[in-house]
């Protein structure tokens, strides 16, 4: 019988008392085979973290700063359940730390030196740790003691709770630096008042502070937010302009064998029976003998943290950067305006080989990081382990939802002004063998399908989106008798046709022979009835253009396209017989790396792009014998996006809507995790 006990860690006598009450009340409402609570008392949160890591306890609720500590080795804990605030309809699990300024003040984030600052309090998250952590490497040396460095960075501050004797400049704007509401500039509202009164130039608060203090839009319009990319935005655009997105209060558990499903089962049942307004006898979110015991008194309920989410992703790149800077206190030697090497994310073995070759040829401008799947690469770019990669539109969507931005687009047509003219896109098509003459778009049910990969544009999002509109359910593995759609669940019929050996079967990378455009076409040639690819795939792999044994004798004339009206056309008539127009593949990165990735890639393509004539003796960025490694092999150049610099603008409203409709069929664990952070 599996042990269904969750050992909750308490950090005080009062918490232990509440925990015992929690245990007893749960016993009275949960069947004997359901989850139960046991209580473990420790002296501090750090002791609780160590106890969970050592398997002496299972769960504890922590503030964001402690979630970071819990994540660090050797603890390796992960977030499993989040408290939420507000209503069930609009649950808030995060708040945003922001920098508020007056509209007419004219400076940006990188011009804060010499300004006057208003803080909620020394050592507090939004008011001190996050802004000072992000500014850390701009502070004058020596950076220790930190208060002295901050005092020398700003021309005056109000940082309540600071030592006014040792650091008088930190109390210059609020004499005495009082650490309670007796100081009119203490806390969120106090820091905002410090700005409003004209004492300071910038207030470090949270996103709701301005709405809690100013009821009129006309008054709020006198203020703006400073964004990390050195722009400003209106105060209601905090989701796109903040210093960090911070989780409010989170239950953590072990990453391996951490009972996360059991913890969720327990807390979900607990909120049903003892949540807000549920029971007079015991209330989960109430602390008669103290404040915020076990859980925050202000919480309204719990939400399950998606399993794909580790602590780094949950806390977010900006928060982790700020806290790491403060804790470790390390900065690059002398900060220069020069770009650091771009860390390119390479998928599996084949891409890594090409990337290493690129790295050597780039003389240190490019470094390589490996991952097994596209989603793993996106996650690495999010958390700073990697910087960039080129993605199919379907993954540009996921990357965008995860906060990344497109920076350059692959162009596939030769033109005089390639780098300045991003193309409208390519065509997603359905290819069949000419010999299967009875096959049309309308009778694909029960046939064998070949896809580039789950979540990709031409191979999945477009055809499956169209199919979903027809069949109104997500059971595509029942619609086709079998197929190869790399990235599907291994036991799915959509992995049955795949050719990868052992663990590589159906993997969404080049270790699966039927992965990508060329792989999906090969699947059609060897086993399938229909392949969902791009309009260039057939000509690129027929007529001797692909020398691989399976392709070298293929003839374009032996294949036809399925049109949406139920007819068929020759391959060259793709412009009048396609499923949809697909956005070109694009390079994505984090917002903070956008300028450097743009600059370095443009240099790199001038050195190794289409202008290189002999690829046998020289490195060619856009060549890999039809394997589309790192970039599509038919890329002519990487083009500027001009104003299409967000994933929505780049992909276009129609495609975003189409992928959004398919979201209900999504198996993307990363998309689930990212929409948890930003619904």
């Amino acid at each position: 019988v599996p042990d269904k006990t969750v050992r909750w860690c308490a950090v005080s006598e009062h918490e232990a008392t509440k925990c015992q009450s929690f245990r007893d009340h749960m016993k009275s409402v949960i069947p004997s085979d359901g989850p139960s609570v046991a209580c473990v008392k420790k002296a501090s949160y750090l002791d609780c973290i160590r106890a969970i890591a050592a398997n002496e306890a299972d769960a504890v609720t922590l503030d964001a700063g402690l979630v970071y500590d819990a994540y660090l080795a050797p603890n390796n804990l992960k977030p499993v359940v989040a408290e939420f605030y507000g209503s069930k309809e609009d649950p808030q699990t995060f708040y945003y730390a922001v920098a508020v300024v007056k509209k007419d003040s004219g400076f940006q984030m990188n011009q804060l030196r010499g300004k006057k600052s208003c803080h909620t309090g020394l050592g507090r998250s939004a008011g001190w740790n996050i802004p000072i952590g992000l500014l850390y490497c701009d502070l004058p040396e020596p950076r220790k003691p930190l208060e002295k460095a901050v005092a020398n960075f700003f021309s005056g501050s109000c940082a309540p709770c600071a030592d006014g004797t040792d650091f008088p400049q930190l109390c210059q704007l609020c004499p005495g630096c009082g650490c309670s509401t007796l100081n009119q500039y203490f806390g969120y509202s106090g820091a905002f008042k410090c700005l409003k009164d004209g004492a300071g130039d910038v207030a470090f608060v949270k996103h709701s502070t301005i709405f809690e203090n100013l009821a009129n839009k006309a008054d709020r319009d006198q203020y703006e937010l400073l964004c990390l990319d050195n722009t400003r935005k209106p105060v209601d655009e905090y989701k796109d302009c903040h210093l960090a997105q911070v989780p409010s209060h989170t239950v953590v558990a072990r990453s391996m064998g951490g009972k996360e499903d059991l913890i969720w089962e327990l807390l979900n049942q607990a909120q049903e029976h003892f949540g807000k307004d549920k029971s007079k006898e015991f209330q989960l979110f109430s602390s008669p003998h103290g404040k915020d015991l076990l859980f925050k008194d202000s919480a309204h309920g719990f939400l399950k943290v998606p399993p794909r989410m580790d602590a780094k992703m949950y806390l977010g790149y900006e928060y982790v950067t700020a806290i790491r800077n403060l804790r470790e206190g390390t900065c690059p030697e002398a900060p220069t305006d020069e770009c650091k090497p771009v860390k390119w994310c390479a998928l599996s073995h084949h891409e890594r080989l090409k990337c290493d070759e690129w790295s050597v040829n780039s003389v240190g401008k490019i470094e390589c990081v490996s991952a097994e799947t596209t989603e793993d690469c996106i996650a690495k770019i999010m958390n700073g382990e990697a910087d960039a990669m080129s993605l199919d539109g379907g993954f540009v969507y996921i990357a965008g939802k995860c906060g990344l931005v497109p920076v350059l687009a692959e162009n596939y047509n030769k033109s005089d002004n390639c780098e300045d003219t991003p193309e409208a896109g390519y065509f997603a098509i359905a290819v069949v063998k000419k010999s299967a003459s009875d096959l049309t778009w309308d009778n694909l049910k029960g046939k064998k399908s070949c896809h580039t990969a789950v979540g990709r544009t031409a191979g999945w999002n477009i055809p499956m989106g169209l199919l979903y509109n027809k069949i109104n359910h997500c059971r595509f593995d029942e619609f086709f008798s079998e197929g190869c759609a790399p990235g599907s669940k291994k036991d799915s019929s959509l992995c049955k046709l795949c050719m990868g050996s052992g663990l590589n079967l159906c993997e969404p990378n080049n270790k699966e022979g039927y992965y990508g455009y060329t792989g999906a076409f090969r699947c059609l040639v060897e086993k399938g009835d229909v392949a969902f690819v791009k309009h260039q795939t057939v000509p690129q792999n027929t007529g001797g253009k692909n020398p691989d044994p399976w392709a070298k004798n293929l003839n374009e004339k032996d294949y036809e396209l399925l049109c949406l009206d139920g007819t068929r056309k020759p391959v060259e008539e793709y412009a009048n017989c396609h499923l949809a127009r697909a956005p070109n593949h694009a390079v994505v990165t984090r917002k903070d790396k956008e300028a450097c990735v743009h600059k370095i890639l443009r240099q790199q393509q001038h050195l190794f792009g289409s202008n290189v004539t002999d690829c046998s003796g020289n490195f060619c960025l856009f060549r890999s014998e039809t394997k589309d490694l790192l970039f599509r092999d038919d890329t002519v150049c990487l083009a500027k996006l001009h104003d299409r610099n967000t994933y929505e603008k780049y992909l276009g409203e129609e495609y975003v809507k189409a992928v959004g409709n398919l979201r209900k069929c999504s198996t993307s664990s990363l998309l689930e995790a990212c929409t948890f952070r930003r619904p």
Partner: nanobody, 123 residues
Framework: DVQLVESGGGSVQAGGSLRLSCAAS????????MAWFRQAPGKEREGVAA???????TYTDSVKGRFTISRDVAKNILYLQMSSLKPEDTAMYYC?????????????????FGQGTQVTVSS
């Protein structure tokens, strides 16, 4: 979630006064913005006045100078003092609350409403 219960409505002559009250079951993040709405027969519900967590207020033009919104945070009660009442103020008055993720004057974002209290102003 938060429960809101209004009281204080009634019938009054034009030029008279009324004070509406609204008791909130809990004081929480989702009551940081509170407002009064009204709905006259055959018309859409409209925002009348709102108050932010720390007391800043906003009014729709038609009631400025006549109505005052206030709140007692300790008791979780919202008030609307209405004076110089006019027949066109006749309506069902609702108390509402929302989280401070947008302006308290953004009436379309209010998510929780009470059952309402009737105010009738006769000439």
């Amino acid at each position: 979630d938060v429960q809101l219960v209004e009281s204080g409505g009634g019938s009054v002559q034009a030029g008279g006064s009324l004070r509406l009250s609204c008791a909130a079951s809990i004081y929480t993040y989702s009551t940081a913005c509170m407002a009064w709405f009204r709905q006259a027969p055959g018309k859409e519900r409209e925002g009348v006045a709102a108050i932010a967590r720390y007391g800043d207020t906003t009014y729709t033009d038609s009631v400025k100078g006549r109505f005052t919104i206030s709140r007692d945070v300790a008791k979780n009660i919202l008030y609307l003092q209405m004076s110089s009442l006019k027949p066109e103020d006749t309506a069902m008055y609702y108390c509402a609350s929302k989280s401070p993720n947008s302006g308290c004057d953004e009436y379309a974002h209010y998510e929780t409403f009470g059952q309402g209290t009737q105010v009738t102003v006769s000439s």
